[in-house]
Interface confidence: medium
């Protein structure tokens, strides 16, 4: 069974998938469609790297631009370094500016909804 066929079989169960499962899926050549990606738990999507999302979505990564103002894409963008987002070649804006440090302060983030940044 190839990645696409496997994805079809598990698609309906993915809404509640944890980050670890999404990371594993990104290595399986599944080409997750954007409709499914948009239904994923925001907290599961946030830790994914740009490279992992690109692998997870396959051709559908080109559609992220259309969803950049919607959750979970909007929140995921806020967590990525702008440098990394730029490598997607989609003109996504809103990432962490170059030269900033990201402090993983869970309480701060829980309260504000955004990561804590220290300027250069």
């Amino acid at each position: 069974m190839n990645g696409s066929e496997y994805f079809v079989k598990i698609q309906s169960f993915l809404g509640g998938a944890p980050t670890e499962d999404l990371k594993a899926l990104s290595q399986q050549n599944v080409s997750m469609d954007l409709a499914t990606f948009m239904k994923l738990r925001t907290d599961a999507v946030l830790p994914l790297t740009v490279a992992e999302v690109q692998k997870l979505l396959g051709p559908h990564v080109e559609g992220l631009k259309a969803e950049e103002r919607h959750r979970p894409v909007r929140d995921w963008i806020l967590r990525q370094r702008q440098d990394d987002l730029d490598t997607l070649g989609l003109g996504l804006q809103g990432g962490i500016p170059n030269g900033y440090l990201v402090l993983d302060l869970s309480m701060q983030e829980a309260l504000s909804g955004t990561p804590c940044l220290l300027g250069p």
């Epitope: 050549n29 730029d86 070649g89 989609l90 003109g91």
Partner: antibody, heavy 120, light 107 residues
Framework: EVQLVQSGAEVKKPGASVKVSCKAS????????MHWVRQAPGQGLEWMGN????????NYNEKFKNRVTITVDKSASTAYMELSSLRSEDTAVYYC?????????????WGQGTLVTVSS | DIVMTQTPLSLSVTPGQPASISCKAS??????IAWYLQKPGQSPQALIY???YRYSGVPDRFSGSGSGTDFTLKISRVEAEDVGVYYC?????????FGGGTKVEIK
Amino acid sequence: EVQLVQSGAEVKKPGASVKVSCKASGYTFTSYWMHWVRQAPGQGLEWMGNVNPSNAGSNYNEKFKNRVTITVDKSASTAYMELSSLRSEDTAVYYCAPHYIGSRPGFAYWGQGTLVTVSS
Amino acid sequence: DIVMTQTPLSLSVTPGQPASISCKASQNVGTNIAWYLQKPGQSPQALIYSASYRYSGVPDRFSGSGSGTDFTLKISRVEAEDVGVYYCQQYNSYPLTFGGGTKVEIK
């Protein structure tokens, strides 16, 4: 207005290489991936591959993987498709087309096509 | 690779009459399908994306439907300018693939 202007027709001998250019205007070149599709005389459409203009990352159709190279010149908003070890079956019209422009998937815009004739 | 099979190969239609083209995918592609029309001597032009949405400027006599593996493009009333070859294309996974085409002619 989106415009894709391709280089002129080429006649090549078997075993040679050809490099076709596609100059884009009317949109942000680095925000949309560029794809190449070919069409042999009287035949259907065949996807060759694409390129991410931001970092020159590419995906290729396995059928062409060892013979095709897709590159970009960001400063000139131009994409290139080079096909090597040409054979008569490569005689075709080659099209460039960005995907997902205006947030809609699919190839909404196409270059005018470049006819490559391979003949001894 | 996902194989896209179009039927019929050709279609001869009386102006004002409907026409229907079928496209079957060898595996589930959701609604990640586009339809194109290539008029004689021209580059392809986009008609439908996401299986059922018309691109701007496309007349409403064109409609698309289907999901999974079976898709249909319908022209409610064929006009002379609709002649050409129609292609379906999946963008669900690499490599992107096209159907073999359906040639539409006017009777």
